[in-house]
Each structure stands twice: as structure tokens, then as C-alpha cells.
């Protein structure tokens, strides 16, 4: 039985042209994280954080994605097309995979509020 839980930044909004931090946190498990995958709503991989090899940012996102903080991801120069779901997948021994979901809404408005509260989906 998998005992861990993934906490994520939940539903967040940010300004067009701005940046946002996508963050997942695995807790309540002794499992060892060997890799974290970050995917976009269309299932395309943005980045991988491998325990041995470190970060790999996929070419299509190299200009707009920065690794970190921690196992999280920073998305920069946001466009309206960035609106949608993002998933973190933690590969852990011996528990298996844990998956977290974040919904990002990119707003035209200059009063866009970037909420970064942690919540368990």
C-alpha cells in the first residue's frame, strides 16, 4: 500500500508574460525518489529531474523553463497557451509512482493574482 501523499500548488493563476513556480512535494513515505517527470496537459514532457543525471529540460521548453526550486519547475514568459493542467510524476522505490496535478490559468489582466497555497488534490 502506498502511504505517501503529494501536495501541490493546486489551482494557480499568473499574468501573461510573467512567471510561475510549479511545485509538488511528496510526504509521509520512506520511499526514495529516483526521478520526477513534469508533463503538460497534452502529455508532452517539459522536464525530468533524475537522481543521478540531474535536470533535463526538453528542447521545446528550454527557453522558458527553469529547473527548481527543489524538485519544482519555474515557467517563464507565460502565454495564454500555457493555461491548462500540469502533472508531476514521482518515481519512488519501493512505493511506485505518485502523481500530482496543478491547474494554471494565465490571465491577460494586470491584476492577475498568483496564488501559491499548498493543497492536497
Amino acid at each position: 500500500m502506498m502511504t505517501g501523499t503529494i501536495e501541490t500548488t493546486g489551482n494557480i493563476s499568473a499574468k501573461k508574460g510573467g512567471s510561475v513556480i510549479l511545485q509538488c512535494h511528496l510526504s509521509s513515505t520512506m520511499a526514495q525518489v529516483t526521478q520526477v517527470n513534469w508533463e503538460q496537459h497534452d502529455h508532452s514532457l517539459l522536464a525530468i529531474r533524475n537522481a543521478e543525471l540531474g535536470w533535463h529540460i526538453y528542447p521545446a521548453f528550454k527557453d522558458r523553463v527553469a529547473p527548481g526550486p527543489g524538485l519544482g519547475l519555474t515557467l517563464q514568459s507565460l502565454t495564454m497557451n500555457d493555461t491548462g493542467e500540469y502533472f508531476c510524476t514521482y518515481h519512488t522505490y519501493p512505493d511506485g509512482t505518485y502523481r500530482g496535478r496543478i491547474f494554471l490559468e494565465v490571465l491577460e489582466s494586470s491584476v492577475a493574482e498568483h496564488s501559491a497555497r499548498f493543497q492536497i488534490p
Epitope: A31, Q32, T34, N50, A51, E52, Y93, P94, D95, G96
Partner: antibody, heavy 122, light 106 residues
Framework: QVQLVQSGSELKKPGASVKVSCKAS????????MNWVRQAPGQGLEWMGW????????TYAQGFTGRFVFSLDTSVSTAYLQISSLKAEDTAVYYC???????????????WGQGTTVTVSS | DIRLTQSPSFLSASVGDRVTITCRAS??????LAWYQQKPGKAPKLLIY???TLQSGVPSRFSGSGSGTEFTLTISSLQPEDFATYYC????????FGGGTKVEIK
């Protein structure tokens, strides 16, 4: 090359303690979980548990709690297995084994130490 | 806990024979199964992981198949160096090994 080198054979009396070492080389020690496996004479392989090489947290399989302790010294890339209050039935070959692969389907014990024979006899 | 049952426990075969070993899991484990070879006095060696992926350096006469609860290891043409004991193993949740299959010379 990637390898695990274990300490030599031990002959111990009942009630004594033993500490087996497993030194890793050729890879980043803290990137891969480490397991311990026991093989009694003429028997199969028995998983004893594992240690998280990032945090040092050990997890013990049923039957291996109490007298068995897993530990690490990451500064020398070494895992340890200590057994206290030794009994005749602890006589076995003890292996350390690394979990290879980074994604769940790839996980397997890909690198093994050569084994350490522990003999408990009066 | 997941239990792995191997069959047969012993197998007599000749060089050149096709050999098949079965491993059954007490509950579904997807493709999270590995096969190991062990020779007397030596440590086990990983042959196959993820049910069917050959470990680097392992001869192609070894193959694995199956998913869920039933898995097989096949040696297409047994060679003299293949006489050994074979174990299936799974590493998810509570890792475990099958009881082993000793492949002996007929």
C-alpha cells in the same frame, strides 16, 4: 566500473554481534536505494529490507526487526548491516544489492555485492 | 505481501534445449518483474527487468514475457554456462523472490 565490495567472511559465537560492510564505487552512492538479501545454506534468496541512501531511513522486512540494523556512511559510500545477539539460524550469506533504474518499471537489483558469509557456531 | 511461486523447482535439460521457467505472482504486479541467474558460490546476476527487457551484456538467447500475475523466462538454446539456479523477483512495495529453479544437466 560500478561495483559493490563487501567485507570478508565472519565466524561468530552465539550471542555475539557482527557488522558487514558494503562499499560502493563507480556511481553516485546517494542516487540509488540499497537493499540487503539473505541466503541461508542451500536455500533461496530472502529480502531483508532496504535503506534510503538519501535520508538514511531503514525499512525492515518481516522477521528482520529488532536484531538487524541497516546504516550508512555516505562520506565513504558504504552501507552496513549489523546483526546482534547472533543465533545459529543467522548462518547465511548476506548480500547488498543496489536498485537500478530510475523509473518504476526499470527497478531491479542490478548490482550485487559478492556476498559475506556469516557463520554462527559455538 | 506479494508472493512469487516458481515452477518447476528442478529442471533437467541438455545443451541446445529450449527451456521455459514460470513465475506466478499472488496478485497483479504489472510488468514489474525481474529474472536473476545464480551460480554456486556466486552472487545473483540480473538477466531481465521490466518482465521482458534484457539487461546489458546478457545473451539474446534469454528472453522474458508476461504481465500481471504470470511470467516466463525462456532460454532458446541452453548453453553449458547456463546451468545454474534462476530466480524471479519483484521490487515493488514489499520486494520478494521466487523459490528458485535449478537447471541441471540431463
Amino acid at each position: 566500473q560500478v561495483q559493490l565490495v563487501q567485507s570478508g567472511s565472519e565466524l561468530k559465537k552465539p550471542g555475539a554481534s557482527v557488522k558487514v560492510s558494503c562499499k560502493a564505487s563507480g556511481y553516485t552512492f546517494t542516487s540509488y536505494p540499497m537493499n540487503w538479501v539473505r541466503q541461508a545454506p542451500g536455500q533461496g534468496l530472502e529480502w531483508m529490507g532496504w535503506i534510503n541512501t538519501n535520508t538514511g531511513n531503514p525499512t525492515y522486512a518481516q522477521g528482520f526487526t529488532g536484531r538487524f540494523v541497516f546504516s550508512l556512511d555516505t562520506s565513504v559510500s558504504t552501507a552496513y548491516l549489523q546483526i546482534s545477539s547472533l543465533k545459529a539460524e543467522d548462518t547465511a550469506v548476506y548480500y547488498c544489492a543496489r536498485v537500478g533504474g530510475f523509473t518504476v518499471p526499470e527497478y531491479a537489483f542490478d548490482i550485487w555485492g559478492q556476498g559475506t558469509t556469516v557463520t554462527v557456531s559455538s | 505481501d506479494i508472493r512469487l511461486t516458481q515452477s518447476p523447482s528442478f529442471l533437467s535439460a541438455s545443451v541446445g534445449d529450449r527451456v521455459t521457467i514460470t513465475c506466478r505472482a499472488s496478485q497483479g504486479i504489472s510488468s514489474y518483474l525481474a529474472w536473476y541467474q545464480q551460480k554456486p558460490g556466486k552472487a545473483p546476476k540480473l538477466l531481465i527487468y521490466a518482465a521482458s527487457t534484457l539487461q546489458s551484456g546478457v545473451p539474446s538467447r534469454f528472453s522474458g514475457s508476461g504481465s500481471g500475475t504470470e511470467f516466463t523466462l525462456t532460454i532458446s538454446s541452453l548453453q553449458p554456462e547456463d546451468f545454474a539456479t534462476y530466480y524471479c523477483g519483484q521490487v515493488m512495495r514489499y520486494p520478494a523472490f521466487g523459490g528458485g529453479t535449478k537447471v541441471e544437466i540431463k
